[in-house]
Amino acid sequence: HTAAQDNCTCPTNKMTVCSPDGPGGRCQCRALGSGMAVDCSTLTSKCLLLKARMSAPKNARTLVRPSEHALVDNDGLYDPDCDPEGRFKARQCNQTSVCWCVNSVGVRRTDKGDLSLRCDELVRTHHILIDLRHRPTAGAFNHSDLDAELRRLFRERYRLHPKFVAAVHYEQPTIQIELRQNTSQKAAGDVDIGDAAYYFERDIKGESLFQGRGGLDLRVRGEPLQVERTLIYYLDEIPPKFSMKRLTA
């Protein structure tokens, strides 16, 4: 009888099924929806999380309109195809054979087409801008305190290496967090900025993906930081390919 058997859950992903049937009774966890093995010492990929979210029973699902994106992703939630490593497949299709290409965070980056649509590679999202507006406070937050607290959050809660938090901007009431991570910068074991941003987005909405942890309690020098609006912009290493018709609509 081991400690793993007493608490066989996944600390970093509550959307899992776990059982103590690994070596020496260790806890082995699989993502809902895909059944894929999950590493509970780090963040789960956004693709597997979306798949798990779509597989959850309708009455257990919290329907929240997704953020607006730089790529104007108004498609909402979808049930994605993930590769064996849990990343988004470059081409996604729905049940009616409508297909489109996505970037590494699963956001559509082309017009929709049919099954003949080709998506040659998964284009990496290398720059994410998280744009927040906080609720009114007695005064503005101190910029350096705010900067330090948000960097600490991404380092400790999401395990994102500090070098990938490029900047924190603040003009009351708007806070902007810039995450940057080129393909060449991302080493094995590094948390992906897309996954960190998704966990943060869900935390901000009060839908934490962490097992048994309380919701996100953001404080700057003891003062609660309450977010009332979130926009996330994704920039890809290769610009998206939309027709002019869409751009002028």
Partner: nanobody
Framework: QVQLQESGGGLVQPGGSLRLSCAAS????????MSWVRQAPGKQREWVSY????????YYADTVKGRFTISRDNSKNTLYLQMNSLRAEDTAVYRC??????????????WGQGTMVTVSS
């Protein structure tokens, strides 16, 4: 990139033996924990055996304990599974996997394509 290539599978009679090999490349094999997993037709993949990076610690699923032996040769970047006293219920696709073991959790992150083992008279 990580590559794992299994070999040694085949058709064997109940009570017989097979030795599976797994050639690894694309990562520092000598510092990686490894496992063998298997998947029988229509069943979920199950963990079979685990070995730590230097070969000093091994674990076996109850279903194969005493019959299977996992080993590795870090100088050849190769993982092995010696299977004795084979039974019909051992029939499955066997895959080697890179693994990670903590005090409480176990996970595999890369798998080979697999080699088929059929135990039948």
């Amino acid at each position: 990139q990580v590559q794992l290539q299994e070999s040694g599978g085949g058709l064997v009679q109940p009570g017989g033996s097979l030795r599976l090999s797994c050639a690894a490349s694309g990562f520092p094999f000598s510092s990686a924990d490894m496992s063998w997993v298997r998947q029988a037709p229509g069943k979920q993949r199950e963990w079979v055996s685990y070995i730590n990076a230097d070969g000093s610690k091994t674990y076996y699923a109850d279903t194969v304990k005493g019959r299977f032996t996992i080993s590795r040769d870090n100088s050849k970047n190769t993982l092995y599974l010696q299977m004795n006293s084979l039974r019909a219920e051992d029939t499955a696709v066997y895959r080697c996997a890179r693994a990670k073991l903590t005090d409480t959790h176990y996970v595999e992150d890369y798998w080979g394509q697999g080699t088929m083992v059929t135990v039948s008279s």
